[in-house]
Every structure is written in C-alpha cells, then in structure tokens.
C-alpha cells in the first residue's frame, strides 16, 4: 500500500480467483483514543471501533472511502483504491491501446518544435467517474524539471456502437536546450483513476524523436509565362524553431489528381519554393521535415491547381 | 579549414559533408517503427558516447561568440564514433554486408574529422572509447543503439555547419 | 573475387617460435575481424582467436593465451599470427578465416615441429 | 564456454540417400551457427549460417535448421561430392567452438 495523495492510498493486488488480498490497517487521524469507529462509504454498518482498523482487501468491494467517526462526527477519511496485476502485468483497463508506432502504445506524444514544450494524448471509453494526473521529468534516476498542466477532455469520437473520448496533455520542460543533443529521455508518468481502479501508464521519448512540425504556411501558386508549370512558395511555419539556418526543414512537393488513384508527382527540396507542372483539377501539397533527423512529417498544406 | 589555434572551418564544405552523414546515419539504419530498446540494458559502449550538450556553445549564440569549443566537441565526437564503427562490433559477426552503408558513414566521419583538423594540428581528443571486445550477440543491440545514438549527434553536428556557412562563412 | 592467401608450410625445431601470414585481397581489409583456427592431423577445429584489423583489437581463446599472438599489417592487407615455445602439440595446420558468416577461409600453413 | 555435442561420429550413406547430422549447444545460442564442409586435405567450405541461411552456391539439397540449442543439418538426395567431415560452430560468444565433427563416408 502506497499513498497516492492525501487521504488516498493504492492497494498493490494479485489479481486471481481466490488470492489472499493484502491485510490494509487503517490509522484514524485524531489525538482522540476511544469512542472510535468506523464506516464504508455511505453505509452506516459499523466495521470496526478503536484508532485503527485492520481489514483483509481482495476485491473492489473492499476498497472505497473508509471513515472514522466519534459521536456522530466525522474524524477523517482514507481513501482506497486498487491496482490489478494479473499474471505478474499491471491492468490497462482504462486507456485504449493505440497500437502506433507499436502495441501497447497507450500514450502518445509530439513537439512542434525544440523548445521543450509537448502535447501528449490517449483515449478511453469510460465517460465518467475519470480522472487523470500527469508527472513529466527529464531523465529518471536524477530528474530535471518538466511543468505539466491538467488533463482535459480534447475530443470525442464515435467508434461504431462506442464513444471514443481523448484527453490530453501540454507539458513544458523547465530548462529546455533547443540546440543540445539529448542524452536523458523525456519520461511521462499519468495516473488515472476509474472509480476505485487505480491505473499508471508511462511513456518514455527524447523530444527528437516526437518532433512533428506544423505544416508549411502561406502555400502559394504563381504560374510561369507560355508554360503548364508553376512555381509553388511557401513558408516555414510559425511554431517552428528559430533561427531556420540552424533549424532546418526540408520539404516534400506533392501533384496529385483528383483520382486517388492517378499517379503522384513528388519532388523533394530543401528550398521554400519549387517548380512543378499543375495539370487540371489536380492539387498541390506541401509538407515538411526535420532536414537533419527523420522524424515525422508534417500534414499536407495544400492548394488546388486551378 | 578548423585550427585549434581559432581560424574559420570551410563551413560549406564541412555542411555538405556533414549532410551526407545526416543521410547515411539513418540509411544504415533507418527507424523501423521505433523499436525502441532504451530499456534494454543499456551497455557502456552507448553509455560513454560524447553528447553535445548544452554549455558545449553549439546554440546560434555560442557558435558566433566563439564556434572553436563547439568545434572541437563535434570533432571528439566524430572520433569517438569513427572508432566505435571500426571496432569488432561491426565488423565481426553477424557480418554486415560488403555493401552496407556503415562503410561509407565511417569513412564520411574520418573525412568530416579530417576537415575539423588537419594534419600536423591537435585538439586534445578526450574520450577515445576504451573498447573490450564484444561478444556476437551482444552486437545487434549494440549497433542498433550507436546508430541511434550517431544519427541524434550528426543531426546536431549539421545544424552547426548550416548555420555556419550561411551566418559564418567569410 | 575475395583471396585469404597462407604462407608456405613451416619446419620448425622444439622451443622456436614461427610466424605465418594471411594476405587479404578482394575486399576491404579492415571491415571484418580474421580469426585463426587449429586443425591437428585427422582430428577437429580449434578456434585460436581474432584480430581486428581496423584497430588492431584482439580476443583470444584463453587456451591459445600466451602461445599465439596476432597482429596486422594495414598497407599490405595482411594477418599474422605468431607462435611460441613451440612443441610436438602445436604440429597443425593453421587457417585464418574472415567473419565466420562470411565463408571466406585460406588454403591452411602445415607447421610441423619436430628435432 | 559453450560446448558444442555433434552426432553421430560418423555416418555410412549411399548417393540418393537422404542423411541428417545433430548438434546440441550446452547452452541457448540462438541462431547463431554454422555448418561447414571439409574435404581431406582441403578447408572447410561453409555451407550454412544462422542456422538456416545456405551460403552462397551452396546446393538446395543442403538445409539446415533450429534454433536455441538444437539444430540439424540435412542432406537430400547424397551426390558423390557430399562425401567428406561435416562441423558445426556456434558464434554466439568467445570461445567460438566447434562440434568433434560427422565423417560421412559412401556405403
């Protein structure tokens, strides 16, 4: 048993049919020493008198808030929750597997840039009784700083019979070094509780390695005189790092038809413009690229030929 | 060319080459779906390797107040590393083949170090890798890592000569 | 068309010691280690060691420890390998072979000690 | 160290025949083995590395197999030419050993 936060603490289990549970004893937090019991949740049935109560817990209905009590006042409360290991595994019943880049992705996470600043996110179906707290460190064993806010509802999705609901999460770290090479990775820590379940998930990452810039802006055509080509400019984006002859992007130039089916023209760049041949009710799209370390692309940034 | 003595690097050049070495990194190994093997065991070999870190002056500010202490932290790395590919790790079993980009990563970062650091100049080179020889099964894992490892140095490393040659360069 | 080429067989007295050669040829010396093997007559192999030439690295069958030495030579693309205090035991023929993987073995130097 | 225990010592075949030879490794080495070939007076020529992959030129009749601590090197349909002493060698850690070896002789 461990305390999660005031009051609450995580009940450790093996979860299998018939296991002995764990022995939890509860202390009453008063100078009081007699005249003392005890109740579970909103139940009035008295468990136990004295300062402390010793319970066996096995399953979730042990678990919940216990409350100690003199003379019809209420003294203090502890409340517990429990995490499932079953077959040595922690349950992961709360989030969804993502299952990109790999199974068992549960939180996933990205940078628009070396500032330090990241969004994490990860989905559930559970709709109520849900919280999250998220902890961010860089490195483990001697941890420097990483500020995280609060979890919160990003999205909702309808997946066939299921509502799909997405949390997440801005977190920025308290000394980035945009131009340093990382050494220590960034680690992710969410608690989340479901009830009286209690689940943590991590995620491990350098910044390099979830960088995924905003797509290139201001994408613009300009046909070339007595010619089907024409020459398309864009920007680097806003969000990107600074300055751009140190941070570099390279560029992915895409034609493609109507059809998806009609074959795609693509030229790779590391200027912000290029030339290329628009053919009718074709689109232009641009993406962009860390130029020095493949990390993911960009979305398309596109624009119609006509 | 870099002399320790303080004098300007052929910035454009040392940016192509580095480029290169951008792009050979990761054909020798590209990222398949982040096989992530942070958590297993990490081995000295990739413990050791020179990181450039952040009172390195390889940041905007720091290569144009003075890009010799960046300069000579990149050249101990490319050391360190044109080592670590030349060590039984690659070329000992499982044996990679005759064709392999790791053959021309090594040589592009003796050219790169070469560049750095003539002939007949010496920058003192910390952390030469002190290499006991590695068992088969351990190279895998191993290689894997200080590709990784290298591919994260080089993108670094390129940033610096960018910047150079377009902010630096005489 | 890779080439692992032996020097020549070897007679030796008790108590010398004899130094034979692997020159290398059709492909790069220096991208894969050269191990030496022990084949005694009408009898199995024996892994002495390896060298790695791009560094001159060495491992050594802690057998072998103290009886043979390896070495290299970069510019002419050749392995060496030494022994000492030699005895009837050491009457062999020797093989160097690159990567093991690789398949590529020299043709064997016959050393025969004997007074 | 990792011993390497080839069976059998030697083995009498007719060309057409079909023969296999075992090696068991005193410990877990994955894939990593190979299988070689020697004729009298000759060196060894490899036939099979990682267990499974046949060495360049080397016939289709050959294959090898395992993985862990087991392996077996199969021969279909002997030819004259496969006669001689078939070794196994692991890779897997310093010292590099070899099985005592398989004389296939013709019956």
């Known amino acids: 048993i461990w305390e999660l936060k005031k009051d609450v603490y995580v009940v450790e289990l093996d979860w299998y049919p018939d296991a002995p549970g764990e022995m939890v004893v509860l202390t009453c937090d008063t100078p009081e020493e007699d005249g003392i019991t005890w109740t579970l949740d909103q139940s009035s049935e008295v468990l136990g008198s004295g300062k402390t109560l010793t319970i066996q817990v096995k399953e979730f209905g042990d678990a919940g808030q216990y409350t100690c009590h003199k003379g019809g006042e209420v003294l203090s409360h502890s409340l517990l929750l429990l995490h499932k290991k079953e077959d040595g595994i922690w349950s992961t019943d709360i989030l969804k597997d993502q299952k990109e880049p790999k199974n068992k992705t549960f939180l996933r996470c990205e940078a628009k840039n070396y500032s330090g600043r990241f969004t994490c996110w990860w989905l559930t179906t559970i709709s109520t009784d849900l919280t999250f707290s998220v902890k961010s460190s860089r490195g483990s064993s001697d941890p420097q700083g990483v500020t995280c806010g609060a979890a919160t509802l990003s999205a909702e999705r309808v997946r066939g019979d299921n509502k799909e609901y997405e949390y997440s999460v801005e977190c920025q770290e308290d000394s980035a070094c945009p131009a340093a090479e990382e050494s220590l990775p960034i680690e992710v820590m969410v608690d989340a509780v479901h009830k009286l379940k209690y689940e943590n998930y991590t995620s491990s990452f350098f910044i390099r390695d979830i960088i995924k810039p905003d797509p290139p802006k201001n994408l613009q055509l300009k046909p070339l005189k007595n010619s089907r080509q024409v020459e398309v400019s864009w920007e680097y984006p806003d969000t990107w790092s600074t300055p751009h002859s140190y941070f570099s992007l390279t560029f992915c130039v895409q034609v493609q038809g109507k059809s998806k089916r009609e074959k795609k023209d693509r030229v790779f760049t590391d200027k912000t413009s290029a030339t290329v041949i628009c053919r009718k009710n074709a689109s232009i799209s641009v993406r962009a690229q860390d130029r020095y370390y493949s990390s993911s692309w960009s979305e398309w940034a596109s624009v119609p030929c006509s | 060319r870099a002399v320790p003595g303080g004098s300007s690097p052929a910035w454009t050049q040392c940016q192509q080459l580095s480029q290169k070495l951008c792009t050979l990194a990761w054909s020798a190994h590209p990222l398949v779906g982040h096989m992530d093997l942070r958590e297993e065991g990490d081995e000295e070999t990739t413990n050791d390797v020179p990181h450039i870190q952040c009172g390195d002056g390889c940041d905007p500010q720091g290569l144009r107040d003075n890009s010799q202490f960046c300069l000579q932290r990149i050249h101990q790395g490319l050391i360190f590393y044109e080592k670590l590919l030349g060590s039984d790790i690659f070329t000992g079993e499982p044996s990679l083949l005759p064709d392999s980009p790791v053959g021309q990563l090594h040589a592009s970062l003796l050219g790169l170090s070469q560049l750095l650091q003539p002939e007949g100049h010496h920058w003192e080179t910390q952390q030469i890798p002190s290499l006991s020889p590695s068992q088969p099964w351990q190279r895998l894992l191993l290689r894997f890592k200080i590709l990784r490892s290298l591919q994260a140095f080089v993108a670094v490393a390129a940033r610096v000569f960018a910047h150079g040659a377009a902010t630096l360069s005489p | 068309e890779v080439q692992l080429q032996q020097s020549g067989p070897e007679l030796v007295k008790p108590g010398a010691s004899v130094k034979m050669s692997c020159k290398a040829s059709?492909?790069?010396?220096?991208?894969?280690?050269m191990h030496w093997v022990k084949q005694k007559p009408g009898q199995g192999l024996d892994w002495i060691g390896y060298?790695?030439?791009?560094?001159?690295?060495?491992n050594y069958n802690e057998k072998f420890k103290g009886k043979a030495t390896l070495t290299s030579d970069k510019s002419s693309s050749t392995a060496y390998m030494e022994l000492s205090s030699l005895t009837s035991e050491d009457s062999a023929v020797y093989y160097c072979?690159?990567?093991?993987?690789?398949?590529?073995w020299g043709q064997g130097t016959t050393l025969t000690v004997s007074s | 160290d990792i011993q390497m225990t080839q069976s059998p010592a030697s083995l009498s075949a007719s060309v057409g025949e079909t023969v296999t030879i075992t090696c068991r490794a005193s410990?877990?080495?994955?894939?990593?083995l190979t299988w070689y070939q020697q004729k009298q007076g000759k060196s060894p020529q490899l036939l099979v590395y990682?267990?499974?992959t046949l060495a360049d030129g080397v016939p289709s009749r050959f294959s090898g197999s395992g993985s862990g601590t087991q392996f077996s090197l199969k021969i279909n349909s002997l030819q004259p030419e496969d006669f001689g002493s078939y070794y196994c060698?692991?890779?897997?850690?310093?010292?590099?050993?070899f099985g005592s070896g398989t004389k296939l002789e013709i019956k």
């Open positions: 060698q692991h890779f897997w850690s310093t010292p590099f050993t």
């Open positions: 060298i790695n030439p791009y560094n001159d690295g060495t």
């Open positions: 990682n267990a499974k």
């Open positions: 410990g877990n080495i994955h894939n990593y």
């Open positions: 072979t690159s990567n093991w993987d690789r398949g590529y």
């Open positions: 059709g492909y790069t010396f220096t991208s894969y280690v």
